[in-house]
């Protein structure tokens, strides 16, 4: 029978008695930076080339005995998970191993840096097909390790890393915190976050997605035919490296941004029990479990978007938080969220020739998050149209006035500390969906984009009585690009996108009372690209 | 690999050289910063990654490393260049006393310095 982890990542159409998806990643080379490995193990023999790279610290303690099987344990298992004959994800992928972890599973930032440099030099000397680098290790936050990962990613390499086994915010660890790296948390057979001893998988906004990482059967270095169960975010990362190899083998031209968006898109959504995570991390942690795409081709027509949360701004009065998209992505909308509800909104602004999403804290606030909606939109030309606070009591309005530009997101930001208290809601005039509406004291920002075949529509869901959460989702075939709350509801904590659903959060109902001000309206902007759909049909 | 297994090699005491003239002052208004792991048990003091500014060439990296050795020698400190980085990030890995950090941060082309730290299998 199929091991639970392989079944979990396999779409139903591939599920047979044996895990045998088409094309096993044969065009892709996966680099593994880990312990030494047992390359003659039946699972990986002929699939893994051991490079001569070794940079490891001495083992701790005078009583440590180097046992070959222990030294090779972690790396052998992971190589098996990526490409093993029986229990591997991408059975056709070839691998190269670099030893950066000693027999105790310990390495150094500097050794890892030299390893990454070795990969870059190898890539320059002998360019091959797509490269995936698996980093099944973690240390404390490291500026230099993150910088090296960024450089390698910008050279076209896909880096996949373990979120860490510290039951902590992954942003406190490297390379997990590097934005360019695909960071993977671990779930178990029940789709629950993995507990390991007293700790468990890391979580938070620096995690891109989760994957199977508990009780994973793979090659054991105890003997050339042995298997063993291992657990951890390394095992989870190895699954994603295998899935990435499969995707890149099917579409070798995929960029890192495209690959990440596809990994997110094809993941199982909302299956993880979030109660395991600390309360303040639940909204920041993606509820996604990795899976292979149902077919190797034909995903290109879709408009892919993902949600990127900023770091917390901190509580000072003028504190701001910034969320950024990857270089190949377009920022299509910007929203903000504050647990205390005290915020001064958000705005899209240019920074280094690229749009970013900036959220503003308010006096007495505990801090804010900026939430960027980052999308893949080829040949896009996007700009922000701003309307300063209006004089009229009707509120502030802004629309996309350029020919062929469509509205993809609305943001509003204000200078007054407590906008909206004792003010009636401002309603959107019907029949004018291509505009953003806000308080008269607020600046309103419309994200307007022109791209071949791009069409968008506004969808609203209003609830007259106060409720902690109001949602509105885009229907099949449409992608959520913008998420905001209609103004006038003073108790709104903020808005953010979760997959294809716009979520507007309000203060605890018990504290707000059920006045007319309790009305909450979630506004979603849903888009699709006819151009991408046509291009995909022409290919097929 | 360059000097990776230098367990038995002596740390080179760099003698005063013409390299050790007046150090080029770092660009006006930019100060190199020092970083270290927030988790104390994972710190590896005594080994530092000196990261140079983005467009620094390999020859400049080597020259900066030699300058550090020379200036350290003048102060009676042993240093050892374990690796010179190029290809991903310009810079070098150096084994030295933490007392020399202030000196190293003032070297030309230096962007920041990070103390080495441990990473672990997950």
């Amino acid at each position: 029978s199929i091991p639970w982890n392989l079944e979990r990542i396999t779409p139903p159409r591939y599920r047979a008695d044996e895990y045998q998806p088409p094309d096993g990643g044969s065009l892709v080379e996966v680099y593994l930076l880990d312990t030494s490995i047992q390359s003659d193990h039946r699972e990986i023999e002929g699939r893994v080339m051991v490079t001569d790279f070794e940079n490891v610290p001495e083992e701790d303690g005078t009583r440590f005995h180097r046992q070959a099987s222990k030294c090779d344990s972690h790396g052998t298992h992971l190589a098996g998970v990526v490409s093993g004959r029986d229990a591997g994800v991408a059975k056709g992928a070839s691998m190269r191993s670099l030893r950066v972890l000693n027999c105790q599973g310990k390495g150094t930032v500097s050794g890892t840096l030299i390893g990454l440099e070795f990969i870059r030099k190898s890539q320059l000397v002998q360019p091959v097909g797509p490269l995936v680098v698996l980093l099944p290790l973690a240390g404390g936050y490291s500026r230099v390790l993150n910088a090296a990962c960024q450089r390698l990613a910008r050279a076209g390499v896909v880096l996949v890393t373990a979120a860490g086994n510290f039951r902590d915010d992954a942003c406190l660890y490297s390379p997990a915190s590097a934005p360019e790296v695909i960071t993977v948390g671990a779930t178990n057979a029940q789709d629950q976050p993995v507990t390991l001893g007293t700790l468990g998988t890391n979580f938070g906004r620096c995690v891109d997605l989760f994957a199977p990482g508990e009780d994973i059967i793979g090659a054991s270095s105890d003997c050339s035919t042995c298997f063993v169960s291992q657990s951890g975010t390394s095992q989870a990362a190895a699954h994603v490296a295998g899935i990435a190899a499969m995707m890149l083998s099917a579409e070798p031209e995929l960029t890192l941004a495209e690959l990440r968006q596809r990994l997110i898109h094809f993941s199982a959504k909302d299956v993880i029990n979030e109660a395991w995570f600390p309360e303040d991390q639940r909204v920041l942690t993606p509820n996604l479990v990795a899976a292979l795409p149902p077919s190797t081709h034909g995903a290109g027509w879709q408009l892919f978007c993902r949600t990127v949360w900023s770091a917390h701004s901190g509580p000072t009065r003028m504190a701001t938080a910034v969320a950024r998209c990857a270089p190949d992505e377009e920022l299509l909308s910007c929203s903000s969220f504050s647990r205390s509800g005290k915020r001064r909104g958000e705005r899209m602004e240019a920074q280094g020739g690229k749009l970013v999403c900036r959220a503003h804290n308010a006096f007495g606030g505990e801090g804010v998050y900026a939430i960027a909606r980052c999308c893949l939109l080829p040949q896009a030309n996007c700009s922000v149209h701003t309307a300063p606070p209006a004089e009229a009591s009707m509120g502030t309005r802004v629309h996309c006035h350029q020919q062929g530009h469509v509205l993809t997101g609305c943001s509003s930001h204000w200078e007054v500390e407590d906008l909206g208290t004792h003010k009636p809601p401002v309603l959107r005039p019907r029949g004018q969906p291509n505009q953003c509406v806000g308080h008269r004291e607020a600046s309103i920002h419309a994200s307007c984009c022109h791209a071949p075949g791009l069409e968008c529509k506004v969808k609203e869901h209003g609830i007259p009585a106060p409720q902690e959460q109001v949602t509105v989702a885009c229907e099949e075939g449409w992608t959520l690009t913008g998420c905001s709350a209609l103004p006038g509801t003073s108790h709104v904590l903020g808005a953010y996108a979760v997959d294809n659903t716009c979520v507007v959060r309000s203060r605890d109902v018990s504290t707000t009372g059920s006045t007319s001000e309790g009305a909450v309206t979630a506004v979603a902007i849903c888009c699709r690209s006819r151009h991408l759909a046509q291009a995909s049909q022409e290919l097929q | 690999q360059e000097d990776e297994d230098g367990d038995y090699e002596e740390l080179v005491l760099a003698l005063r050289s013409e390299e050790d003239g007046l150090a080029e002052a770092p660009e006006h208004g930019t100060t190199a910063t020092f970083h270290r792991c927030a988790k104390d048990p994972w710190r590896l003091p005594g080994t530092y990654v000196v990261v140079l500014k983005e467009e620094t060439h390999l020859s400049q990296s080597e020259r900066t490393a030699r300058r550090l050795q020379a200036q350290a020698a003048r102060r009676g400190y042993l240093t050892k260049i374990l690796h010179v980085f190029h290809g991903l990030l310009p810079g070098f890995l150096v084994k030295m006393s933490g007392d020399l950090l202030e000196l190293a941060l003032k070297l030309p082309h230096v962007d920041y310095i990070e103390e080495d730290s441990s990473v672990f299998a997950q």
Epitope: G105, N165, L196, S220, C226, S231, S234 | -
Partner: antibody
Framework: EVQLVESGGGLVQPGGSLRLSCAAS????????MSWVRQAPGKGLEWVAN????????YYVDSVKGRFTISRDIAKNSLYLQMNSLRAEDTAVYYC???????????????????????WGQGTTVTVSS | DIQMTQSPSTLSASVGDRVTITCRAS??????LAWYQQKPGKAPKLLIY???SLESGVPSRFSGSGSGTEFTLTISSLQPDDFATYYC?????????FGQGTKLEIK
């Protein structure tokens, strides 16, 4: 689905020997530690012995040390218990069980996380009597 | 060797009752404790591992708690299928010991 089937039980005289076998179906047999557990008539459970995946480590309850030997054959997906110098108090139903556990790493190194005996055989009866 | 002591030895209860079985270890075993259910003539079945983690497929009315030397198994609302003998088991350095068992019978 992993299944365990014990065999080899029977009636034996005190001082005699018996070899119990446990046949496993399912790929995961070789991936876990395995145990033998016994239950004397009308009594509770008693753990007897266990063995690592590759057979390199074995542990026994004090009362059987030097008399019983646990072994496994990965190629045959089988677990064995060789019982020598049998005594009346060894009379029991003998179960083989899979010790579900997993290895993981943290900053302290390699660790073992134990879940428990999650798959059991139906048992085989051993009677030691003259 | 670590001894495990279960109490009570026998427990009479009715369907719908909330019942608690206690297990004490002779020395600290951290959270390395499992609970099993056994019905006459059948092999034991794993219910709880690591003191409080519910094994897959086990009804949520079963729960475990405790650490160190004191552990409890609780059945929140007894069902007819729950009348059986329950055993605790400690894991310590690859060798195990079971408690003597608690027989849960219909009142």
């Amino acid at each position: 689905e992993v299944q365990l089937v014990e065999s080899g039980g029977g009636l034996v005289q005190p001082g005699g020997s018996l070899r119990l076998s446990c046949a496993a179906s399912g790929i995961t047999f070789s991936s876990y530690w395995m145990s033998w557990v016994r239950q004397a008539p009308g009594k509770g459970l008693e753990w007897v012995a266990n063995i690592k995946q590759d057979g390199s480590e074995k542990y026994y309850v004090d009362s059987v040390k030097g008399r019983f030997t646990i072994s496994r054959d990965i190629a045959k997906n089988s677990l064995y218990l060789q019982m020598n110098s049998l005594r009346a108090e060894d009379t029991a139903v003998y179960y083989c069980a899979r010790d579900r556990g997993t290895y993981y790493y943290d900053s302290g190194g390699y660790n073992y996380y134990y879940y428990g005996m999650d798959v059991w055989g139906q048992g085989t009866t051993v009677t030691v009597s003259s | 060797d670590i001894q495990m002591t279960q109490s009570p030895s026998t427990l009479s209860a009715s369907v719908g009752d909330r019942v608690t079985i206690t297990c004490r270890a002779s020395q600290s075993i951290s959270s390395w404790l499992a609970w099993y259910q056994q019905k006459p003539g059948k092999a034991p079945k794993l219910l709880i591992y690591k003191a409080s983690s519910l094994e897959s497929g086990v009804p949520s009315r079963f729960s475990g708690s405790g650490s160190g030397t004191e552990f409890t198994l609780t059945i929140s609302s007894l069902q007819p299928d729950d009348f059986a003998t329950y055993y605790c088991q400690q894991y310590n350095s690859y060798s195990y010991t079971f408690g003597q068992g608690t027989k849960l019978e219909i009142k």
